[in-house]
Amino acid sequence: EEELQVIQPDKSVLVAAGETATLRCTATSLIPVGPIQWFRGAGPGRELIYNQKEGHFPRVTTVSDLTKRNNMDFSIRIGNITPADAGTYYCVKFRKGSPDDVEFKSGAGTELSVRAKPS
C-alpha cells in the first residue's frame, strides 16, 4: 500500500475581510491512524489553528465529519477573517503515539490572502 500523502490542492486562497475562508485538505490513506492538525506558518513559530484531538477552536469548522471512520477529508472553514489571519496554512497528519502523537506528514500549504472589505 502506498504511503499516505496530504494533499492541499489550493496553492492560494483570496478572501475578503469578514468573510469565511475554506482551506482544503485530503489524505490519500486511512493509515497510519492519528489526528490532523492545522497550523499557520511552519517551524517552531507556527500557530496552532485546529487540533482534531483536543481544544476549543471557535472560529474553525470542519467541512466533513471527522469522527466518521473512513473520513479522509480534513478541510476546514475559518470564519470572520481579518488581516491578521493572512499567511500560509498547513494541514499536518500525526501518527498516533504514546505518550504523544508524532508528526507524520504535512501538506504543501495554502497561502491565505486577505483583501480589505469594500467600503
Partner: antibody, heavy 118, light 108 residues
Framework: VQLVESGGGVVRPGESLRLSCAAS????????MNWVRQAPGEGLEWVSR????????DYAESVKGRFTISRDNSENTLYLQMNSLRAEDTAVYYC????????????WGLGALVTVSS | ETVLTQSPATLSVSPGERATLSCRAS??????LAWHQQKPGQAPRLLIY???NRATGIPDRFSGSGSGTDFTLTISSLQTEDSAVYYC??????????FGGGTKVEIK
C-alpha cells in the same frame, strides 16, 4: 479556567525577576498566552504573547530585548523573565489566555505586583 | 498602529439608569473589538467580544454594538456592582494588541 501568577516582588533598577502563571481548567497547550501589565492608577498595556507551541513570540516595544516570554506545556505554566528592570516597569502583571490564535483575551489571572525601586 | 480612544473618561450614572460608553478606533477593526470590566482591586473580566457577543455568564443588561471604527458598550440599567473601569480591546491588527484608555463608571 484558572490562572494564578506568582513571582512578583520588590527589586532595584537593573535587577531581574521571573514571573510564573500556573494554568488549569483548559487545554493549555492549545492556546496562545499573553502578559498584560497595569502601572499604578493607569490603564492596561499589552506586554508579550507566546503561541501555543512556544516557538512564536511577540513583544511590546517598551520591553523588547529585556523581557522573555516562555512556556512549559508539560507543566501548564507560562513565564515572563524580566531583565534590566526600570522604574517604569512597576506594575501589576496579569497573564491572560487568548480565545483563539487571533483573538481577544477571555480569561485573566489575578495579577502579580512588581515594584522596581531604588 | 491602531489607536483606541474611549469617551468619556468618567461617567457618573444613577442606579437603574442607562450608561453609554464609546470606543473609537483610528482605523477599521471590523467587528474585532472586545470590552473588559475591571472593578477596583480586581483583575479584568471579559464582557463582550466580536463587538456584540456577550461572554459566558455576563448579565443581559450589558450589550455591545458597532463595527468599523465606532463602538458602544451599553449598560441598560446600572447596578451598584457595575462601578468599574471599562476597557475596549482591538484584535483586528496585531501585534501589538491595543486597549483603550478606559472609562470609569461611577454610581451617582
Amino acid at each position: 479556567v484558572q490562572l494564578v501568577e506568582s513571582g512578583g516582588g520588590v527589586v532595584r533598577p537593573g535587577e531581574s525577576l521571573r514571573l510564573s502563571c500556573a494554568a488549569s481548567g483548559f487545554s493549555f497547550s492549545s492556546y496562545a498566552m499573553n502578559w498584560v501589565r497595569q502601572a499604578p492608577g493607569e490603564g492596561l498595556e499589552w506586554v508579550s504573547r507566546i503561541n501555543s507551541g512556544g516557538g512564536g513570540t511577540d513583544y511590546a516595544e517598551s520591553v523588547k530585548g529585556r523581557f522573555t516570554i516562555s512556556r512549559d506545556n508539560s507543566e501548564n505554566t507560562l513565564y515572563l523573565q524580566m531583565n534590566s528592570l526600570r522604574a517604569e516597569d512597576t506594575a501589576v502583571y496579569y497573564c491572560a489566555k487568548q480565545y483563539d490564535w487571533n483573538g481577544f483575551f477571555d480569561y485573566w489571572g489575578l495579577g502579580a505586583l512588581v515594584t522596581v525601586s531604588s | 498602529e491602531t489607536v483606541l480612544t474611549q469617551s468619556p473618561a468618567t461617567l457618573s450614572v444613577s442606579p437603574g439608569e442607562r450608561a453609554t460608553l464609546s470606543c473609537r478606533a483610528s482605523q477599521t477593526v471590523g467587528s474585532k473589538l472586545a470590552w473588559h470590566q475591571q472593578k477596583p482591586g480586581q483583575a479584568p473580566r471579559l464582557l463582550i467580544y466580536d463587538a456584540t457577543n456577550r461572554a459566558t455568564g455576563i448579565p443581559d443588561r450589558f450589550s455591545g454594538s458597532g463595527s468599523g471604527t465606532d463602538f458602544t458598550l451599553t449598560i441598560s440599567s446600572l447596578q451598584t456592582e457595575d462601578s468599574a473601569v471599562y476597557y475596549c480591546q482591538q484584535y483586528y491588527y496585531w501585534p501589538p494588541y491595543r486597549f483603550g484608555g478606559g472609562t470609569k463608571v461611577e454610581i451617582k
